[in-house]
Amino acid sequence: GSERTCCPVNWVEHERSCYWFSRSGKAWADADNYCRLEDAHLVVVTSWEEQKFVQHHIGPVNTWMGLHDQNGPWKWVDGTDYETGFKNWRPEQPDDWYGHGLGGGEDCAHFTDDGRWNDDVCQRPYRWVCETELDKASQEPPLL
């Protein structure tokens, strides 16, 4: 079937997920499109431990994640509940700032140089991280 039991080439396995780290930038929607074509999604950060893992791999570089509020409320791309989930915003963020002069506010979340999150204009060409979960069935211990 289509179940994934190990990570593809050039992806990094961590805690039963696979991660791919870009080395160049795209707008949020185009990064999202890239991940989806690879049967993945922009990274969804669900714990401090996952935050530190991603932060270690991306370094001090603005990097898109799978969090946006383009349709109103903040939403994770995989449906993970935002309100009750892990958050790591910078102080005073998100602020939906309109002062950048690019039109509109700021609807897409990214890791900043210190790893904490900021909302920014979705058209900015930032690096991104894709994530895909390994097949849940493969987590079961083998039958003896």
């Epitope: 289509s2 593809p8 050039n10 870009s22 080395r23 160049s24 930038g25 795209k26 707008a27 929607a29 185009d30 990064a31 499109n33 890239y34 989806r36 074509l37 690879e38 049967d39 060409p125 690096r127 991104w128």
Partner: antibody
Amino acid sequence: EVQLVESGGGLVKPGGSLRLSCAASGFTFSSYPMVWVRQAPGKGLEWVSSISISASYIDYADSVKGRFTISRDNAKNSLYLQMNSLRAEDTAVYYCAKLGTTVSGGHYFDLWGRGTLVTVSS
Amino acid sequence: EIVLTQSPATLSLSPGERATLSCRASQSVSSYLAWYQQKPGQAPRLLIYDASKRATGIPARFSGSGSGTDFTLTISSLEPEDFAVYYCQQDSNHPLTFGGGTKVEIK
């Protein structure tokens, strides 16, 4: 041999339907996104549709949205394009292509079939 | 949608000469640009990706350069088999798009 072979093209009247197939061999078909690209006679190349590895994500050019359906069968190493409500402007050679990825995050067509001609005319 | 404009439309050269093909994007595509070669009756073939990286099996006489909006494909010394149509393609912004092509013909 690493190759893609398209079939299913032909002459069809406006409003008609066709189903194109693409048979893959020589590589792990189930590990790559795939696309259809077309080329009208004497014209340039136009992306038509993309499909992710397990078909969980599908995308279409505006010009074919709602009329064409892309699908794949990884067990059969095959890619398909169902074309309905065909128009004269859909006349083209249709190529299937493998979508290769790069470390920078680019998607490029690193393997192409030889194409199949679709002619829409009354 | 990003528009890619290729120039010249036709390039008439002799074998052994240097060919310089241009591709200009309507907005920045960073380095997400590829070049393809297509001979009559054949499928396109990937030559260059990420603006400057040669695809597997492509001879060293083909080179790509540029970033942002201006890109160049150079064929250092034309071989008889290089006379064909060349297309650029961007994968920076959705939808991915192709240029209109440059035909390299024998002078």
